[in-house]
Interface confidence: low
């Protein structure tokens, strides 16, 4: 929008709100809001809230992902969690006396129940709750590879902490691999980083639900805090829709050609689902900071302009040397929501819903 | 630009070309193209070309960095390389018989010559040329911390290779730390990943300029292939200009608020410096694929539109639910250039010069 025109802020906000109405429905592949007739009254089940909070925590702990999103990533993801195989299972027997590592096993049939086909999996995270600790330790994560071999996945430097904290590891590739194999028990190993010179290779970090209980520790409520896999996947019915519908093309050099780039400002806009959209069907959250971009991005280069005067303006107004710069989002963040389909609560994550910053582009 | 209007493609290209003229000069903080009077004739010195090629390789091997760029990052970076202290230096004496690691030491006074002040450093990479190898090995990089301690920096899984290949590690933080300390010798350790169970902790990877020469290997030409630090820094004179000029604000939630987002196409545009800009002062490259974005991004949501018809269009035309979507770059890449200042050739990298893909935003 040009600076010379008076901007009707309320109109811009209204347009953004109505665009969001369509965005949410389209991300959920809904032609209209779901019927509210059969929604159970009262608070959401604890397990659903725990799942929603896990998703919310994931969003809070991450920076926006500005990668171009493939078509499948545009649509909402169903979020589920698969708990680690119970510690009483015989599979843990031979791992009991190893001081440098702890082990977590998962049943791939439980995973397959949540994600029937490997390509549907969008993201898988291994979540571990680390208990409070006064020592710093460098730890590593491995994947069970064959009978007695382990494949390195990643590492983390864990600093002392006064409170329990959740650790998250991206294990999308590993879980997709498991889904491509037959059913069975698969696992991870969480180890001390063993140095070439050091003799003390003991794992000092304690993980809730694995490490021996300390006196005075409370048992975990409904096992909510034992290690689990947080899975985000495209529901099967939505995936079928995906294959049949016209594909969205990746807008890169392989396909087509064109450019613009520039800096401006992000304006605050809170969307209250009930008040702004007239929706009661989204149970959590009640609303969110959608925000929007607005502001001038003048094209500031012309042959007759004195170089020295104009050069200082480039950085702010047209860093991408665009032919017609305009004000757009730079960093976007996802939004997890809880809603009902019939009597069944669902946790879904909608990508690129929250505008965190803008630029002239 | 609206679909209803006929787009004058030549005019758009002209505007983009003129914008690029200003962009390059402004990134280099030049009020006008440098004088060509004293430029030495003939080919560029080998060291300058090697440096330019290192920078070019870095660009090719990396995806665009879509992070919001701080003010200093907008401007061009001078690229220099600092070679590892010669292997004949006595400092390597005590490291000779260690089988699990190789060591690389650097003189901080050499680094300080290239980067007089720590904040000027934009990026530092440790570059190692790995010789051909038939084994897979998990390796780790450490920084010399105090007399006998090493701080873990990162790891890499090296797969077998038939040809020598360059490895690159981001060591920006480490080099900045060295610059904040006094002059002296600092170093890195490149080690086998030592497993808690494994007994074979030997480093099988061979690094050019460090590992013992194999029969038939040629000596490295001018030591170009021994480990080095690739440094990108804001030149001192440009930095002083930075401090004195009006600062560009980071356009994120810390500073301001506003929104737009949507999909379109990237158009091909090759800039020939001599032909399109009338410039002879850029020695390498002769031109580059700048490209630009163009295409309609209709606002496709309104209260009276039938939901089902419109929802399918969201993904392509307004994924960010913008109030006024427009066509902008999505992925941008930098451009390294070689030019002369007086009789001195300079290698600089200009950020966000090449448009790789677009989106409606």
């Amino acid at each position: 929008l040009s600076t010379s025109k008076t901007i009707d802020m309320e109109l811009v906000k209204r347009k953004r709100i109505e665009a969001i109405r369509g965005q949410i429905l389209s991300k959920l592949r809904l032609a209209s809001p779901p019927s509210q007739g059969e929604v159970p009254p009262g608070p959401l089940p604890e397990a659903v809230l725990a799942l929603y909070n896990s998703t919310r925590d994931r969003v809070a702990g991450e920076s926006a992902d500005p990668e171009p999103e493939p078509e499948a990533d545009y649509y909402a993801k169903e979020v589920t969690r698969v708990l680690m195989v119970d510690r009483n299972n015989a599979i843990y027997e031979k791992t009991k006396d190893i001081s440098h590592s702890i082990y977590m096993f998962f049943n791939t049939s439980d995973i397959r129940e949540a994600v029937p086909e490997p390509p549907l999996l969008s993201r898988a995270e291994l979540r571990l709750q680390r208990l409070k600790s006064s020592v710093e330790q460098h730890v590593e994560l491995y994947q069970k590879y064959s009978n007695n071999s382990w494949r390195y996945l990643g590492n983390r430097l864990l600093t002392p902490t006064d409170t329990p904290e959740w650790l998250s590891f991206d294990v999308t590739g590993v879980v997709r691999q498991w889904l491509n194999q037959g059913d069975g028990i698969q696992g991870f190993r969480f180890s001390a980083h063993c140095s070439c010179d050091s003799k003390d290779n003991k794992l000092h970090v304690e993980i809730n639900g694995i490490s021996p209980k300390r006196r005075g520790d409370l048992g975990t409520i409904h096992d909510m805090n034992r290690p689990f896999l947080l899975l985000m996947a495209t529901p099967l019915e939505r995936a079928q829709h995906l294959h049949s519908s016209r594909h969205r093309r990746a807008l890169d050099t392989n396909y087509c050609f064109s450019s613009t780039e520039k800096n401006c400002c992000v304006r605050q806009l809170y969307i209250d689902f009930r008040k702004d959209l007239g929706w009661k069907w989204i149970h959590e959250p009640k609303g969110y900071h959608a925000n929007f971009c607005l502001g001038p991005c003048p094209y500031i280069w012309s042959l007759d302009t004195q170089y020295s005067k104009v050069l200082a303006l480039y950085n702010q107004h047209n860093p991408g040397a665009s032919a017609s710069p305009c004000c757009v989002p730079q960093a976007l963040e996802p939004l997890p929501i809880v809603y009902y389909v019939g009597r069944k609560p669902k946790v879904e994550q909608l990508s690129n819903m929250i505008v965190r910053s803008c630029k002239c582009s | 630009l609206s679909t209803s209007k006929t787009i004058d493609m030549e005019l758009v290209k002209r505007k983009r070309i003129e914008a690029i003229r200003g962009q390059i000069l402004s990134k280099l903080r030049l009020a006008s193209p440098p004088s060509q009077g004293e430029v030495p004739p003939g080919p560029l010195p080998e060291a300058v070309l090697a440096l330019y090629n290192s920078t070019r390789d870095r660009v090719a091997g990396e995806s665009a960095d879509p992070e919001p760029e701080p003010e200093a990052d907008y401007y061009a970076k001078e690229v220099t390389r600092v070679l590892m202290v010669d292997r004949n230096n006595a400092i390597y004496e005590k490291t000779k018989d260690i089988s699990h690691s190789i060591y690389m030491f650097f003189n901080t006074s050499d680094i300080r010559e290239a980067v007089p002040e720590p904040p000027l450093l934009s990026r530092a990479e440790l570059r190692l040329q790995r010789l051909k190898s038939s084994v897979e090995q998990h390796v780790e990089l450490y920084q010399k911390y105090s007399n006998n301690s090493w701080r873990y920096l990162g790891n890499r899984l090296l797969t077998p290779t038939d040809t020598p290949e360059w490895l690159s590690f981001d060591v920006t933080g480490v080099v900045r730390q060295w610059l904040n300390q006094g002059d002296g010798i600092q170093g890195f350790r490149f080690s086998a990943h030592c497993s808690c169970d494994s007994k074979d902790n030997k480093l099988h990877v061979e690094i050019n300029g460090i590992s013992p020469k194999r029969r038939g290997d040629l000596g490295t030409i001018h030591d170009m292939n021994r480990p080095f630090l690739l440094l990108m820094a804001t030149p001192l004179e440009r930095a002083q200009h930075l401090h004195s000029s009006r600062h560009r604000r980071a356009l994120d939630t810390n500073y301001c608020f506003s929104s737009t987002e949507k999909n379109c196409c990237v158009r091909q545009l090759y800039i020939d410096f001599r032909k399109d800009l009338g410039w002879k002062w850029i020695h390498e490259p002769k031109g580059y694929h700048a490209n630009f974005c163009l295409g309609p991004c209709p606002y496709i949501w309104s209260l009276d539109t039938q939901y089902s018809k419109v929802l399918a269009l969201y993904n392509q035309h307004n994924p960010g639910a913008s109030a006024s979507p427009c066509c902008v770059p999505q992925a941008l890449e930098p451009l390294p250039i070689v030019y002369y200042v007086g009789r001195k050739p300079k290698v600089e990298q200009l950020s966000n010069m090449i448009v790789r893909s677009c989106k409606c935003s």
Epitope: E10, A60, C265, V266, R267, Q268, K275, H289, N291, R356 | D252, T253, N254, Y255, C256, F257, S258
Partner: antibody, heavy 121, light 107 residues
Framework: EVQLLESGGGLVQPGGSLRLSCAAS????????MSWVRQAPGKGLEWVSA????????YYADSVKGRFTISRDNSKNTLYLQMNSLRAEDTAVYYC??????????????WGRGTLVTVSS | DIQMTQSPSSLSASVGDRVTITCRAS??????LNWYQQKPGKAPKLLIY???SLQSGVPSRFSGSGSGTDFTLTISSLQPEDFATYYC?????????FGGGTKLEIK
């Protein structure tokens, strides 16, 4: 001169009502969101309520929700706070504050001198 | 609700001292944090908004930093008129909440 002037405070019994007013001058009143912030004797600041420039959106602290109503009359450049079912814990100095949200942040850039509300039997 | 915790609750310092007051949010609030100064019997006055932006007319000895959950207000060289109570406030979400205040007294 840019200023805010509160009025309407006083002594009221528990369960009673009171209406506070805030007269604005020196700036375009309808362009700014406005807010009420209170401070109990010897205590810290507590946000009470806010209203958008047009009056279309209102916000309340949980402690006053359902009892207090914020409103504005842009033609009179005046902000109001209707307080019903008052309790002893509502005793405080009530400040009227202008909200600057031009950069997308909400911050109170202009404050009135405050008016004292005492709830006591 | 987002809780804002200020520390210390009171602080004694001398003219010319460098003083730092911290504010911690119970959850990440990005940079939606403001700082106010209040003198006895007076209304609060805005010093810093958006974590680090100095309000016009406020002396440059005041500065703010931080983002996420941890924030600081720094007075580089205390002046006699700076002895007052300082409050932080988040505007990330409603209800808007203030810290408990830090009373800065003359040593």
């Amino acid at each position: 001169e840019v200023q805010l002037l509160e009025s309407g405070g006083g002594l009221v019994q528990p369960g009673g009502s009171l209406r506070l007013s805030c007269a604005a001058s020196g700036f375009t009143f309808s362009s700014y969101a406005m807010s009420w912030v209170r401070q109990a004797p010897g205590k810290g600041l507590e946000w009470v309520s806010a209203i958008s420039g047009s009056g279309g959106s209102t916000y309340y602290a949980d402690s006053v929700k359902g009892r207090f109503t914020i409103s504005r009359d842009n033609s009179k450049n005046t902000l109001y706070l209707q307080m019903n079912s008052l309790r002893a814990e509502d005793t405080a100095v009530y400040y009227c504050a202008r909200v600057d949200s031009s950069g997308g942040y909400w911050y109170f850039d202009l404050w009135g001198r405050g008016t004292l509300v005492t709830v006591s039997s | 609700d987002i809780q804002m915790t200020q520390s210390p609750s009171s602080l004694s310092a001398s003219v010319g001292d460098r003083v730092t007051i911290t504010c911690r949010a119970s959850q990440s609030i990005s940079s939606y944090l403001n700082w106010y100064q209040q003198k006895p019997g007076k209304a609060p006055k805005l010093l810093i908004y958006a974590a680090s932006s100095l309000q016009s007319g406020v002396p440059s000895r005041f500065s703010g930093s931080g983002s996420g959950t941890d924030f600081t207000l720094t007075i580089s060289s205390l002046q006699p008129e700076d002895f007052a109570t300082y409050y932080c406030q988040q505007s990330y979400s409603t209800p808007l909440t203030f810290g408990g205040g830090t009373k800065l007294e003359i040593k």
